[in-house]
Amino acid sequence: ATKLTEEKYELKEGQTLDVKCDYTLEKFASSQKAWQIIRDGEMPKTLACTERPSKNSHPVQVGRIILEDYHDHGLLRVRMVNLQVEDSGLYQCVIYQPPKEPHMLFDRIRLVVTKGFSGTPGSNENSTQNVYKIPPTTTKALCPLYTSPRTVTQAPPKSTADVSTPDSEINLTNVTDIIRVPVFN
């Protein structure tokens, strides 16, 4: 099995995690993709997923999680906005390819969210003109439920994360709780 590597990201409450997961566009452009959390001793749980088939650059919002799948660039963008301490944990991007096991996109993200004022710009932040507007017509996709083995033998591409906290306020409307749907029974 492939060694699972992870990168640690330490953020403050209220900041945004911005993750970019690369994939082979010719293979997986229209495949359904998901953002999962891995808790100690448990199977990965899906927090949000794209539609099936995945739509190009069409945002899907589940609570404070926004997924955008860019087919032309072979990239899944995952944002977790207004982070809370309880969001701390280990995350990963996966590509669903039933009946085969999910294709995992490494590296896993070790997210550590701490309390504290997040108003001071971080090293990855950009200008005051950076604004996040979450579209009001985002879609909530239904994530599949199916059993899959624990092991992954194929070495996939990697993912990475970026901290992004625009000075402008993040305006989320009609936000629901994060849905945690287990992918593995």
Epitope: D18, K20, N56, S57, Y70, H73, R77, D107, E125, T160
Partner: antibody, heavy 117, light 107 residues
């Protein structure tokens, strides 16, 4: 045919302003992040700015923040770069490129901006 | 800002031989790295994204490898049209940066 065509590059004095335009065709412009990348004579590539499909996110390299503004008109399939307070170090070929969420997969042929007195 | 450093600045290789270009990031960019080719008077062309995934239409002789901070672009058997300048680019954070370029010339 997929095409990005830049225009607006001229000789301008330091402190002056300029607006670059990029006309897109053959791509789904309204679905694409777009960017400006520049290249000073004999030098390497430098990303300048990018903009999301709906204009809701814009990012800039530090050296142009507060001076340059990226914008777009999806109805006209056009990308713009408003350049104010120009400096000699802004002299470069400016490329319009599709992308900005990650890579730049389609490029124009560039327009030359010269800042000199 | 993530600094991207390419080496060597110039690489002289004979046609048919193998060329290996390196790119180092000042901090981890995971797999968020791309390679471009640029010929004189032309716009750059995307070759590789995700550190190792060939862009559409790119010949199989081009391959990318590496992750985090160390990356390599390999051209297995150089063709005459491959002599150009090659740039790496990271897109991990929103302050995108390119390497200074490696000029691949005919030996």
């Amino acid at each position: 045919e997929v095409q990005l065509v830049e225009s607006g590059g001229v000789l301008v004095q330091p402190g002056g302003s300029l607006r670059l335009s990029c006309a897109a065709s053959g791509i789904t412009f309204s679905n694409s992040w777009m960017s400006w990348v520049r290249q000073a004579p004999g030098k390497g590539l430098e990303w300048v700015a990018n903009i999301k499909q709906d204009g809701s996110e814009k990012y800039y390299v530090d050296s142009v923040k507060g001076r340059f503004t990226i914008s777009r008109d999806n109805a006209k399939e056009s990308l713009f770069l408003q350049m104010n307070s120009l400096r000699a170090e802004d002299t470069a070929v400016y490329y319009c490129a599709r992308g900005g969420i990650s890579t730049f997969d389609i490029w124009g042929q560039g327009t030359m901006v010269t800042v000199s007195s | 800002e993530i600094l991207m450093t390419q080496s060597p600045a110039t690489l002289s290789v004979s046609p048919g031989e193998r060329a290996t270009l390196s790119c180092r990031a000042s901090q981890s960019v995971s797999s968020n790295l791309a390679w471009y080719q640029q010929k004189p008077g032309q716009a750059p062309r995307l070759l590789i994204y995700g550190a190792s995934i060939r862009a559409t239409g790119i010949p199989a002789r081009f391959s990318g490898s590496g992750s985090r901070t160390e990356f390599t672009l390999t051209i297995s058997s150089l063709q005459s049209e491959d002599f150009a300048v090659y740039y790496c680019q990271q897109y991990k954070n929103w302050m995108y940066t390119f390497g200074q370029g490696t000029k691949l010339e005919i030996k």
